[in-house]
């Protein structure tokens, strides 16, 4: 097989057109991603076969492997195959897309694997990171394949810099199945304890009659041995349990507790580990942030959520304007605190069909005998705007005035507009905005008042029209963050006797 150009690696320009030719003594074909792209096949007079693949309007997504192979039923040797790798540097393409299959790497043994993050430009510097860390891992990179090495059972991402922006790849997950005929599980009554409390761990083996347990734990390393107790769980066949009990834990008992189980008949073994943390005293810690100003919309329901970690389990109270809240019998307020993991809690305050009176200063307090934390925020009730009044008058001065009054929270904006051609506006022609400083024929005066009791703003705006020479449709639109409302009135010139 003869390939032109020969490669084995080409770097082509984005948006360009490029021709690849392959020829051989039998029919030949170009393959890309296990498929045959459109190509021109021919047979010359001297019996040589060829295939021409024309790549047009190249993009970064054309980066990858191209193969030329014999397309023949005579079964020529399978190694008669030429590989070409094309790069099309394209700043709009970060990492080449992966199939879902490539994002999950499954192993049963320790073996070299490739994390297939590939870029379009062979000049780019690519680094590999654990998903949770910033430090680049010392793993060799091949621009055509990705990072190859022996990887732990973790998640990884690749990073590169294109121009001045840092680009991350999708996350790759390495799953290693520890093949074992022994099924061991380890659990603890609690994985967090205070000093002086007890640590109790259980290691359970399923499906084996004769096993040997060996525990490794922080105390053992200092020569202070604890005798585990082994028993059979009679309600289940071949469930054997080893219990490790450490009374009155000390800070030094924090660490990894490993249960190693061996079965001598087939020489199988398995081990599982669990981390135990001994804390000096209990704690309560807020997780994440809740802004000091929260919003709810009138008559809608709103749930306010606080996430925190605590040990031992805390008491949680909610306050509004320093008064304790409880679940209301009318179902207007619901409080719930749920344990989402051993030491993590989510506390929620749900206001059902929010009322204006529920605006105010809210505090959640979580506490136990060792620690407490509190979080406060102001709740603002947003009220959709409504136009309450739109009236027109024409005082003796000769000018005509239109007054618009409306309310809402947060403060509404007011927009005045007019249609001079009543037949065509607003369907065919857009309304004209009024009240701009450049417009001499109209003047605007707007006053805003905050009503403390109703906790909303009132806007009163007066539009003065200097001379109206034909009927005019004047529209007042009020807008705020949660809605808008519009009313319109027809203003008729003084000279017309009717309204």
């Amino acid at each position: 097989l003869v390939v032109t150009p020969p490669g084995p690696e080409l770097v082509l320009n984005v948006s360009s057109t490029f021709v690849l030719t392959c020829s051989g003594s039998a029919p030949v074909v170009w393959e890309r991603m296990s498929q045959e792209p459109p190509q021109e096949m021919a047979k010359a007079q001297d019996g040589t076969f060829s295939s021409v693949l024309t790549l047009t309007n190249l993009t970064g997504l054309d980066t990858g492997e191209y193969f030329c192979t014999h397309n023949d039923s005579r079964g020529l040797e399978t190694d008669e195959r030429k590989r070409l790798y094309i790069f099309v540097p394209d700043p709009t393409v970060g990492f080449l897309p992966n199939d879902a299959e490539e994002l999950f790497i499954f192993l049963t043994e320790i073996t070299e694997i490739t994390i297939p993050c590939r870029v379009t430009d062979p000049q780019l510097v690519v680094t590999l990171h654990e998903k949770k860390g910033d430090v680049a891992l010392p793993v060799p990179y091949d621009h055509q394949r990705g990072f190859s090495g022996i990887f732990e059972d973790r998640s990884y991402i690749c990073k590169t810099t294109i121009g001045d922006r840092e680009v991350d790849s999708d996350a790759y997950y390495v799953y290693r199945l520890q093949v074992s005929s022994i099924n061991v599980s380890v659990n603890a009554v609690q994985t967090v304890v205070r000093q002086g409390e007890n640590i109790t761990l259980m290691c359970i083996v399923i499906g084996n009659e004769v096993v040997n347990f060996e525990w490794t734990y922080p105390r053992k390393e200092s020569g202070r041995l604890v005798e585990p107790v082994t028993d059979f769980l009679l309600d289940m066949p071949y469930h054997i349990r080893s219990i490790l009990h450490i009374p009155s834990a000390e800070l030094e008992d924090s660490g990894t507790y490993t249960c190693n189980v061996t079965e001598s008949v087939n020489d199988h073994q398995d081990e599982k580990a669990i981390n135990i943390t001994v804390v000096e005293s209990g704690y309560v810690r807020l997780l994440g942030e809740v802004g000091t100003l929260q919003f709810a919309e009138l008559h809608r329901s709103r749930t306010l959520q606080v996430v925190f970690e605590a040990y031992p389990p805390p008491t949680v109270l909610w306050f509004k304007d320093n008064r304790t809240l409880g679940d209301s019998s009318a179902g207007e307020i619901a409080l719930s605190t749920r344990n989402v993991s051993e030491t993590r809690y989510v506390s929620e305050l749900t206001l059902v069909r929010v009322k204006v009176a529920e605006a105010g200063h809210y505090t959640m307090r979580a506490f136990h005998e060792d620690a407490e934390v509190q979080l406060s925020f102001q709740l603002q009730i947003n009220v959709p705007v409504r136009v309450l009044e739109l009236s027109e008058s024409h005082p003796d001065s000769g000018e005509q005035t239109v007054r618009c009054r409306g309310r809402g929270m947060p403060q509404p904006n007011i927009i005045w507009s007019a249609c001079r051609d009543l037949k065509r506006c607003p369907r065919e022609l857009p309304p004209t905005l009024l009240g701009n400083s450049s417009e001499e024929e109209s003047q605007l005066e707007t006053n805003v008042t905050y009503w403390e009791e109703e906790q909303e703003f009132e806007v009163v705006s007066t539009l003065r029209l200097q001379h109206v020479d034909r009927p005019l449709s004047v529209r007042c639109t009020l807008r705020n963050a949660v809605g808008q409302d519009t009313q319109e009135v027809i203003v008729v010139p003084h000279s017309l006797p009717f309204k």
Partner: nanobody, 116 residues
Amino acid sequence: QVQLLESGAEVKNPGASVKVSCKASGYPFSAYYIQWVRQAPGQGLEWMGWLNPNSGDTHSAQKFQGRVTMTRDTSISTAYMELSGLTSDDTAVYYCATHGGDRSYWGQGTLVTVSS
């Protein structure tokens, strides 16, 4: 302690369907994708597909499309994988697995035997 507990072994006739369950505990069920993987006798691991327990979205490997259905019941933190049109080539240990970012967790495996 994250744990995945799978249902027991099954023997099926060719052409039948099998439904394997995977009960998760020790973590918020909706937090991590559930993967389904199988291992036929003497073969390596073969990825079948994933399930997003939060949304119920799934994605299966091309080989299994149209034959595999992945579902979940969040109220009992359980994922299910149903494989239809069984043949003897589907005899394998079926695993569910999940990844917490810093390590993977596996079910104990469910042996499915297809024979007439």
